[in-house]
Amino acid sequence: GDMLIEKTIKREVVLEEGTTAFKNWVKTGTTVYRQFWIFDVQNPDDVAKNSSKIKVKQRGPYTYRVRYLAKENITQDPEDHTVSFVQPNGAIFEPSLSVGTEDDNFTVLNLAVAAAPHIYQNSFVQVVLNSLIKKSKSSMFQTRSLKELLWGYKDPFLSLVPYPISTTVGVFYPYNDTVDGVYKVFNGKDNISKVAIIESYKGKRNLSYWPSYCDMINGTDAASFPPFVEKSRTLRFFSSDICRSIYAVFGSEIDLKGIPVYRFVLPANAFASPLQNPDNHCFCTEKVISNNCTSYGVLDIGKCKEGKPVYISLPHFLHASPDVSEPIEGLHPNEDEHRTYLDVEPITGFTLQFAKRLQVNILVKPARKIEALKNLKRPYIVPILWLNETGTIGDEKAEMFKTQVTGKIK
């Protein structure tokens, strides 16, 4: 009995035409939503003039349907037992699951003004940029609609810059009609314990963003893991959103629509400083903002974002050091709402439910040559938005899963 089930599982989780796994892998049967909460700045003038604490108020959720497009350019390589693909990006606004419309306005950090002196540190260039910031009537903060902020807008200051740069700015610009990848993953045909593990990303085994082993692409994309998952296992996965590989550890056993699943959670240890977790030393790439690598809970992903000062954290700076959250008022970190988890069915290794939570922040520093920033007395890691990307197996699929997998084992 058990041997037969094991044999069936091993056959059905292989990523090749005709298997259960392949069908769901090409196009997920799960509806995936991405909810956004925008941090609306309440005291922009006070911050710009007096370097006060930034008072924020989150507004949301604004919900989009994502990951509804099938993988493309799927190519099997029988030689090395891999399958390569790209994942197209798309987002459809869901008004019924949102508190407002895509035209709702927010006061947020001016992304271009904050990033410009960080990218162009030469004093002369900054003087030039300052004259253009003034000419375009730009300042430290700006008012933008949700649609503009997320998906892109033509920036008035950047439009005047006489350098060959992109003048469109947006937290996720460009997104629609783009693809993530190429991913090349093991199909598991020769070794089921390697199924879905990423062999390379964008043609490389390393990211070129981090020094040492931090640069490695480890594990799967978190949609599934090799079967027969044990509680003691650390689940490793790569997330292109945060430009790094990360891991989850067993948290609890839960019942999902009658299916026993293991909830794996991202531990606080993954966001710790090298002082608390020496393994993280290679994720600390600069010494000033990180207070000589003692700060924790924020990840500088600038190298992965063309040098822009982008920092990733958990929502509301959950698991971040006090120095990071101190200059921001209005944050309320909460483990249940703001942590990331994966509910993995242990026999198949399929992720049947997940909640990916992350926050996008921008570093803004005093810049003596930029009038809009010259009154700042300290750097701020400014929260722009946080997101909750969730997916749960549908009722129908869950029933099917129970009869075909868990039911047979019982």
Epitope: Y120, Q121, N122, S123, F124, V125, V127, V128, N130, S131, V161, P162, Y163, P164, R368, K374
Partner: antibody, heavy 120, light 107 residues
Framework: QVQMKESGAELVRPGASVKLSCKAL????????IQWVKQTPVHGLEWIGG????????VYNQKFKGKATLTADKSSSTAYMELSSLTSEDSAVYYC?????????????WGQGSLVTVSA | ETTVTQSPASLSMAIGEKVTIRCITS??????MNWYQQKPGEPPKLLIS???TLRPGVPSRFSSSGYGTDFVFTIENMLSEDVADYYC?????????FGSGTKLEIK
């Protein structure tokens, strides 16, 4: 050490153009801006404009827009300034200079100057 | 455009005396003022950069002060080698503008 080597003196006819060169030595050309300064007994020192070869950024003093054109050739680490439609008002010593880049040291290194004389 | 008014136009001082040159700007430029020395037949030389910063290798008898719109350049004990023209430059905003210069001579 850092050096800015400028082209020699020029005697040019009114209405003609002249192209001055400035070869940068002893540093990475794309890391620092090169600025041009005009000096005459009457007007003293006047900033013409600057070019940052690394970002391809060029900015002019409005007064010299249309008169001066700044370019840079990364392969030879040389900056150029072309002056057009010359008149006697353009007779001056022209300097190319390099700043400190990041430390607020403006015009820290100077070339020896190119004397341009406009005369019929 | 920020106008820089430099005074005096010329100055005749005895060796060992204290020399003071002043530049006033038409707009607030924080401490973005620079000071240059130019000897005959030579290009100007940067002595003091933004933030009243004495450049490496420049003797400590040279100093500057000021913030906003009013700036002063000082030579504590004038030496014969200090005979030159002196210029201030504001680097706060474009276009960069120089003062008209001060000719320093020996009395």
């Amino acid at each position: 050490q850092v050096q800015m080597k400028e082209s020699g003196a020029e005697l040019v006819r009114p209405g003609a153009s002249v192209k001055l060169s400035c070869k940068a030595l002893g540093y990475t050309f794309t890391d620092y801006e090169i600025q041009w300064v005009k000096q005459t007994p009457v007007h003293g020192l006047e900033w013409i404009g600057g070019i940052h070869p690394g970002s391809s950024g060029i900015v002019y003093n409005q007064k010299f827009k249309g008169k001066a054109t700044l370019t840079a050739d990364k392969s030879s680490s040389t900056a150029y300034m072309e002056l057009s439609s010359l008149t006697s008002e353009d007779s001056a010593v022209y300097y190319c200079t390099r700043g400190g880049g990041y430390d607020g040291a403006w015009f820290a290194y100077w070339g020896q100057g190119s004397l341009v004389t406009v005369s019929a | 455009e920020t106008t820089v008014t430099q005074s005096p136009a010329s100055l005749s001082m005895a060796i060992g005396e204290k020399v003071t040159i002043r530049c006033i700007t038409s707009t607030d430029i924080d401490d973005d003022m620079n000071w240059y020395q130019q000897k005959p037949g030579e290009p100007p030389k940067l002595l003091i950069s933004e933030g009243n910063t004495l450049r490496p290798g420049v003797p400590s008898r040279f100093s500057s002060s000021g913030y906003g719109t009013d700036f002063v350049f000082t030579i504590e004990n004038m030496l014969s080698e200090d005979v030159a023209d002196y210029y201030c430059l504001q680097s706060d905003n474009l276009p960069f503008t120089f003062g008209s210069g001060t000719k320093l001579e020996i009395k």
